[in-house]
């Protein structure tokens, strides 16, 4: 049985300065090349090492790019989006949607979006047990008074 995976969606404005090798990332998606089913949006497929995006550090692989210099990326062919980035100029403003994976699964299941490696039950069970022991000890102590 798999856990239910939820996503925490946040938006961010990222300003990049074009480097010698461009903006330093690859994109996928578009109306003619859907990356996510039922979504023709433009997604970051790869961040190039030592490129402008990697050095900035905020853009992540899997991020959805909503706009470039205020130009909406909805319903674009893939190559139209590529050319928009290519001709966006030296200073480029990106509106980006990050999706942080959150695990709400069955006990003991650890999702890839939970990097800490401590399932919540491992914290809750001892706390609950301690509370019960404390309550039992308190009741016994009261009875002795």
């Amino acid at each position: 049985m798999n856990g239910r995976v939820d996503y925490l969606v946040t938006e961010e404005e990222i300003n990049l300065t074009r480097g010698p090798s461009g903006l330093g990332f690859n994109i996928v998606g578009g109306t003619d090349q859907q990356y996510v089913s039922n979504d023709s949006g433009i997604y970051v497929s790869r961040i190039k090492e030592n490129g402008a995006a990697a050095l900035d550090g905020r853009l992540q692989e899997g991020d959805k790019i909503l706009s470039v210099n205020g130009q909406d990326l909805k319903n674009l062919l893939h190559q139209d989006a590529v050319d928009l980035f290519r001709n966006a100029g030296y200073a480029v403003s990106l509106r980006v949607q990050h999706r942080l994976q959150v695990q709400n699964g069955p006990i003991g299941h650890r999702g890839e979006g939970d990097p800490s490696g401590i399932p919540i039950f491992m914290v809750l069970v001892p706390v609950f047990a301690l509370t019960m022991v404390a309550a039992w000890a308190f009741m016994r102590y009261r009875q002795q008074l």
């Epitope: 003619d32 674009l76 062919l77 893939h78 139209d80 989006a81 050319d83 290519r86 001709n87």
Partner: nanobody
Amino acid sequence: EVQLVESGGGLVQAGGSLRLSCAVSGVSFRNMGWFRQAPGKEREFVAAISWGGDSTIYGDSVKGRVTISRDNAKNTAYLEMNSLKPEDTAVYYCAADGRFRAGRISSDLGLYHYWGQGTQVTVS
């Protein structure tokens, strides 16, 4: 994959007419241009049209004899050529601007990133 496919070329008598078509796929909202290249000569600008179809420019050698148009629903550009002369004999190329929704049309060959294979026009 971006593709531009020209059609409509052929052999025509001097004074005759031809209508060339250019079907575009893989890109949209592009300024479109027609260029031609005669044997042993450089590629020459013929005509261009804005992505919205509201603005056109023409090369000096064809002014008044050709009309460029487009049908965005079909993603196709056209070149209507009248009063053809033997010196119009060339391979005619269709090209799409490398910029998405570019502001100004241009005769500058360097701005056209996408090219068709060309269609031969021979005027006898």
